[in-house]
């Protein structure tokens, strides 16, 4: 995590943001904190987006002030009003869209001074993979499925026993467009698997990396999944 500070003017306050990623169709958080003030009425929060004329969100005098809000954000933004007093200016964004990606500025005014910091917000789709034994196949086969990804990810198989092995010749990956015509379902099949081994299906794009593990023994099957967002930086 890289911490940086946004400072402005002679009377300046520290504003800290964290670069993050939004999962399209879900809610997102644009993270911003600042040196708190003792009076809520003295705090002004403005969220702006590069290339957008209107405001993303404004909070001042203890309430939301959205008369200048840009049309693309109408009805989709909220601050955590009860946490503003303790220095939380983070913005909740409803139903994240691909077009929400870009550079945002969190601009703060308090009785102590002013400050701002930029935030890079990426948007895409990412989901947890699930790995199962495909009993319908003629040979021992594993099937890795993840319901929503965008942009199109890469899929790599690995195994605990055959570390460093390249499974591209014995696997097949397909991408099926979902009904909203943006995200895709990822299906990858691994053939000729051996028993008493742990296999990992790794799905990655420039936003997220997800891994689905399956351990197959004669007596049981164990599964585990993990998802990690990439490039979360503070500034």
């Amino acid at each position: 995590l890289i911490i940086g500070f946004g400072i402005s003017g002679r009377h300046s306050i520290t504003v800290t943001t964290v670069a993050s990623a939004g999962n399209i169709g879900e809610d997102g958080i644009l993270s911003c904190t600042f040196e708190p003030d003792i009076k809520l009425s003295d705090i002004v929060i403005q969220w702006l987006k590069e290339g957008v004329i209107g405001l993303v969100h404004e909070f001042k005098e203890g309430k939301d002030e959205l008369s200048e809000q840009d049309e693309m954000f109408r009805g989709r933004t909220a601050v955590f009003a009860d946490q503003v007093i303790v220095g939380n200016a983070s913005l909740r964004l409803k139903n994240v869209q691909l077009t929400d990606a870009g550079t945002y500025k969190c601009y703060i005014i308090t009785s102590k001074g002013k400050g701002n910091a930029n935030l890079e917000y990426k948007t895409g789709a990412f989901s947890m993979p699930e790995v199962n034994v495909d009993y319908n196949a003629s040979s021992e086969t594993l099937r890795c499925e993840a319901p929503r990804w965008f942009p199109q990810p890469t899929v790599v198989w690995a195994s605990q026993v055959d570390q460093g092995a390249n499974f591209s010749e014995v696997s097949n990956t397909s991408f099926e467009l979902n009904s909203e015509n943006v995200t895709m379902k990822v299906v990858s099949v691994l053939y000729n698997v051996t028993i008493n081994n742990t296999y990992s299906c790794m799905i990655e794009n420039d936003i997220a990396k997800a891994t689905g593990d399956i351990k197959v023994t004669e007596s049981e099957i164990k599964r585990r999944s993990h998802l990690q967002l990439l490039n979360s930086k503070a500034s």
Epitope: G25, K63, L66, S67, Q69, D70, R74, G75, A78, K94
Partner: antibody, heavy 119, light 107 residues
């Protein structure tokens, strides 16, 4: 405290237009959007449209050709106008305010205006 | 349009019984579901917003749960004053839509 007060006619002739005013108090129209919802006799609720704090609007596509929502921030008033009413537009019309600036639930409702479309 | 299907259409319960009302969305609406109580000749009253958040002043016998497409309103111990119509609604995407309602009668 937050209040929404509706005023408008109870009887409308077929093919005529309906105008309802929603006057709000306890909050500013520059902070919250105002939604319009109707309820036909013995039926469920139907969302008609919203005017946001910025003045931009979103309408139910089924009514977009004959519905207009506007407001006067300084008077804390929202104006609802629907044209070309027919008998199946007979309903109680409500204005409502959301609990947050993101539409999550209508916490405050007007008292409702019963509109009967009849010759 | 997203269709919200409520079940049952009506139900008759005795005071003290547990009541479970169902609301199913035709597609994913996240947690953007709210529940309303409407008594005869009154405007609807918000009970639950964001699928599971109880609105201020609502008795804690009312609980909302669910996400994506399946939602539930539970009244842990129904009271005589709970006689009303109950509506669910989604505010995830336009047009916002409501279920057709469940009428709760008290035996």
């Amino acid at each position: 405290q937050v209040q929404l007060q509706q005023s408008g006619p109870g009887l409308v002739q077929p093919s005529q237009s309906l105008s309802i005013t929603c006057t709000v108090s306890g909050f500013s129209l520059t902070s919250y959007g105002i939604h319009w919802v109707r309820q036909s006799p013995g039926k469920g609720l139907e969302w008609l449209g919203v005017i946001w704090s910025s003045g931009s609007t979103d309408y139910n596509a089924a009514f977009i050709s004959r519905l207009s929502i506007s407001k006067d921030n300084s008077k804390s008033q929202v104006f609802f106008k629907m044209n070309s009413l027919q008998s199946d537009d007979t309903a109680i019309h409500y204005c409502a305010r959301d609990i947050t600036t993101i539409a999550e639930g209508f916490a405050y409702w007007g008292q409702g205006t019963l509109v009967t479309v009849s010759a | 349009n997203i269709v919200m299907t409520q079940s049952p259409k009506s139900m008759s319960m005795s005071v003290g019984e547990r009541v479970t009302l169902s609301c199913k969305a035709s597609e994913n609406v996240g947690t953007y579901v709210s529940w309303y109580q409407q008594k005869p000749e009154q405007s609807p009253k918000l009970l639950i917003y964001g699928a599971s958040n109880r609105y201020t002043g609502v008795p804690d016998r009312f609980t909302g749960s669910g996400s994506a497409t399946d939602f539930t309103l539970t009244i842990s111990s129904v009271q005589a004053e709970d006689l009303a119509d109950y509506h669910c609604g989604q505010s995830y995407s336009y047009p916002f839509t409501f279920g057709s309602g469940t009428k709760l009668e008290i035996k």
